[in-house]
């Protein structure tokens, strides 16, 4: 059969299963004159043979674990034994069968875990090896917990990563493990090959003893610190402790205060660094963080609460230099004249801010002293002895002492005696007629002037006029300002007029005094006036229901998914057409009728979130007026970025020859979102054979160490491939390359002879 089992001499690759006795020839090479015979060289291991006529075969079962690839060369010779064709490469790939069982590297493992450790964070790895090909199911290992002892309430506290053998706590384990209740656990772990999927898989078991240790990384009790402390600072106020020595502590001020008066030392002791002022800030909340030597957080931050205790360090303050009240001539005993309200910056509802009022002087003392009294705690002034007469004394001045438990302050009150309020305000017109305005009349515009007069004493509360709209303006679109000299009222627009909701408003004004009317006198129809406001329609732009619309979706939503919607209404009731503006990434489309927004392309949080576009609502018909609102699309992260090296690692070298195995540290990162504690990568070598020369070990969630397994390296560059898995959902893996050069060194640097190639590294390890 020409082609499959026979043919001319050319480079070829054959795949043969290991462990099988030879049952057929591999290939029959055909000689082209002047070639008459064939010769086989290379990695024959006395298994591969070629007969002179070109029949290539093997004479006993192959073993992939001894050699996975046999690189052979076949040459064609002429009658004189001279090579006339080739040699050509013939590659024999030995295909794996499951002829090796997995074995754990240790029959017993021991580890410890801290209570409340983060679920899913590995604290121990079990490791098994299988000589079979890891690229096939034969060498693919599957780890499982067979039993957990003790098992409380049938709840598993531990879990194992089926692929990596990483043991970690479950959510329940993180919450419930307590060394006071149960300080130790035992796990039986099994490992199977065939990915655990076959009845014919081989397996092994190991035992894991786990000690549970106490977690002392706990938030301390809230601290109370008295303000204005005169003790020498800094003063220790509390402490935190990481579970192991060597942590680096820091404080995080989430409030971004201009003055942050706390510090932490490397023992975890927390200090206040300067006196606090409760009146400036009465409580602080900040966070204590513990980090490892690489600056990575070791755990969640602890919340520290500091309450500032008040001392009486503020005197009462008067509301103004002089407080003016008015009292009518005929007012009766006990009538309220007004209330003096002093302030105290100390803590409310405590003795430090509780105020007492006392009249210390009245001038003049005519017709007698003690005409007024003040309520001790309320500060309300009352008429105490008799009605007052303006012609005798038109003005009194009171000095009032306001005190808290330590401080006294004097406040001054002027009491003006005014004529009795026996005249009501009278409008000069009872009806101000009709007024027609466009609905887009500017806010602040004066639209009408009204006037009432009052015959009481001028420039007193008895004659001062306040105008109120008591009917026809429930929305509060209008207001009235009074000129205190003329009592003229100016009707102004306070809120936009609206033809659609109030085309005609029948407005009623009331004119009244700030002082009460004397007994027996009442406001009547003369104190009321009306007018009619007619609002005309203006074609207005559509109005969005919100200034900013916000929606939240996962960055991996399918194209065509509805991601949000916007709504606008046209005041005139016209239909609206929606469109998008500023969709720079071309991610979105909007249904021009409904305002629903859909994705039209893959979204990417890492390109920027939130994604901000403008939505435009345009009238259909009419004058096509439009208005604009914002649509913010918040993209929630999915694990869609594989890990990569955090920086460029060209330039790593070891001085050749190595005197002892060496190592170097590298850092990984990825572009996905990570919670406070950062990524948790796992590291392994990128191909099975690299394990003969190299070893990779995890330092923490982002750093790993690449070490040489021996010292017998050539003086040359090696490119080491490393797999980095982010452990996400789904887990993503990146293969990165670390170029490492072994070179002759002079004074710790790579020696480069003149004219040597550029690019040889210059950073030693």
């Amino acid at each position: 059969q020409e082609g499959k089992f026979s043919g001319p001499l050319k480079p070829m690759t054959f795949s043969i299963y290991e462990g099988q006795e030879p049952s057929q020839i591999i290939f029959q090479f055909k000689a082209n004159p002047p070639a008459v015979t064939f010769e086989l060289t290379g990695e024959t291991d006395n298994i591969f043979v070629i007969e002179r006529e070109g029949l290539l075969y093997y004479n006993r079962a192959l073993d992939r674990e001894t050699r996975s690839t046999h690189n052979l060369q076949v040459a064609a010779l002429d009658a004189n034994g001279i090579i006339v064709e080739g040699p050509v490469p013939i590659t024999i790939k030995v295909k794996d069968i499951n002829d090796n069982r997995p074995t754990f590297l240790q029959s017993k493992y021991e580890g410890s875990v801290r209570q409340n450790s983060r679920p899913g964070k590995p604290f121990l790895y079990v490791n098994a090896t299988d000589l079979d090909d890891p690229a096939t199911p034969n060498g693919q290992l599957y780890y499982q917990i067979v039993i957990q002892l003790p098992m409380i309430n049938n709840v598993m506290y531990f879990q194992i990563n089926n692929k990596t053998g990483a043991i970690s706590l479950t959510r329940e384990g993180s919450q419930e493990l307590n060394p006071a209740k149960n300080p130790s656990y035992n796990l039986v772990i099994s490992v199977k090959d065939m990915g655990g999927q076959s009845e014919n898989s081989f397996s092994d078991t190991t035992s894991v003893d786990i000690i549970v240790t106490e977690n002392i990384w706990k938030a301390p009790k809230p601290v109370e610190m008295v303000e204005n402390s005169t003790d020498p600072h800094p003063i220790k106020i509390t402490q935190v402790r990481w579970n192991d020595p060597g942590a680096q502590y820091s404080l995080v001020d989430k409030e971004k205060l201009p003055r942050f008066p706390f510090s932490i030392d490397q023992e975890g002791d927390i200090y206040v660094t300067q006196p606090l002022d409760r009146e400036e800030k009465d409580a602080y909340v900040f966070y204590a963080v513990a980090k490892d030597e690489y600056g990575k957080p070791l755990s969640y931050p602890l919340e520290i609460h500091v309450k500032v205790k008040d001392i009486n360090d503020n005197p009462p303050t008067c509301p103004s230099p002089v407080t003016v009240f008015e009292v009518q001539e005929n007012e009766r005993l006990g009538n309220s004249i007004g209330t003096l309200t002093a302030h105290d910056r100390d803590e409310e509802n405590t003795a430090n801010s509780f105020l007492n009022y006392r009249i210390v002087e009245q001038t003049p003392k005519l017709p007698m002293d003690g005409l007024f009294l003040i309520q001790t705690y309320a500060g309300m002034l009352q008429l105490a002895k008799q009605s007052l007469k303006k012609q005798d004394t038109p003005q009194y001045n009171l000095t009032i002492e306001v005190s808290d438990k330590d401080f006294k302050t004097l406040c001054f009150v002027q009491i003006n005696v005014i004529d009795i309020n026996d005249q009501i305000p009278i409008f000069e017109k009872s009806d101000y007629g009709n007024l027609t305005l466009a609905e887009d009349t500017n806010i602040g515009s004066t639209i009408l002037t009204i006037q009432a007069t009052d015959a009481d004493e001028p420039f007193t509360g008895s004659s001062k006029i306040l105008y109120h709209i008591i009917k026809g303006d429930s929305e509060g679109r209008l207001g009235v300002d009074t000129d205190p000299h003329t009592n003229t009222g100016y009707v102004i627009i306070k809120k936009p007029l609206d033809f659609e909701t109030a085309a005609v408003s029948n407005i009623v004004f009331k004119a009244e005094n700030p002082e009460p009317l004397v007994f027996g006198v009442k406001y009547n129809a003369s104190s009321f006036a009306k007018f009619t406001l007619i609002v005309t329609d203006v074609n207005e732009a559509p109005q969005f229901s919100q200034h900013v619309f916000q929606a939240k979706v996962s960055e991996d939503v399918a194209i065509g998914t509805k991601v949000g919607n916007v709504t606008a209404k046209d005041p005139e009731g016209l239909d609206i057409s929606y469109s998008l503006r500023g969709d720079t990434r071309g991610w979105l489309k909007i249904d021009h009728v409904t305002g629903e927004i859909f994705s039209v392309a893959p979204l990417d949080r890492e390109a920027g979130s939130p994604y901000r576009v403008q939505v435009v609502a345009t009238e259909v018909g009419g004058s096509s007026l439009s208005s604009v609102s914002e649509f913010h699309l918040i993209l929630m992260d999915v694990n869609d970025n594989p890990p990569r090296l955090a920086k460029d690692y060209t330039g790593l070298f070891f001085c050749h020859p190595l005197s002892a195995p060496g190592s170097l540290i590298f850092e990984a990162t990825d572009d996905d979102q990570h919670l406070f504690r950062g990524p948790h990568f796992t590291f392994s070598l990128g191909s099975g054979s690299l394990q003969n020369d190299w070893e990779v070990s995890k330092i923490n969630g982002t750093h790993a160490r690449l070490s040489t397994r021996h010292t017998e390296f050539e003086e040359r560059e090696y490119v080491v491939l490393i797999r980095i898995n982010d452990g996400g959902r789904p887990p993503l893996e990146g293969i990165v390359s670390l170029p490492v050069t072994f070179c002759s060194c002079v004074e710790g640097s790579c020696f480069r002879p003149a004219g040597h190639q550029t690019g040889i590294p210059t950073v030693g390890m």
Epitope: K93, S687, L690, D693, W694, L721, I735, S737
Partner: nanobody
Amino acid sequence: EVQLVESGGGLVQAGGSLRLSCAASGRTFSSPIAGWFRQHPGKEREFVAALISTGGSTRYADSVKGRFTISRDNAKNMLYLQMNSLKPEDTAVYYCVATGNTYRGAYDRPAEYDFWGQGTQVTVSS
């Protein structure tokens, strides 16, 4: 399993250019390191160029540096070798290669590559 098929070889005059292509089938061209070797008649296979896909960095034999450029198109599953300023000593069979599980770090050794194409003949006449 990866199958590699080279094309683009041929006869060219000294100083001329050729572009070799290598199509990967069987699975995506996911090998972290892919490259080109060549074999002169009666000689051992010799490293020409390698492309380390993880960082996009390249390595070249001193004899071809500045004249040859290796590149890949992941979307099309293709590896290329652009050969300029060709010399008669570049005459050889050129093989496309990709790493598998036997890779040990020495990217310029034939034994490091599990997957080989059948080769394409490049002849440079003077």
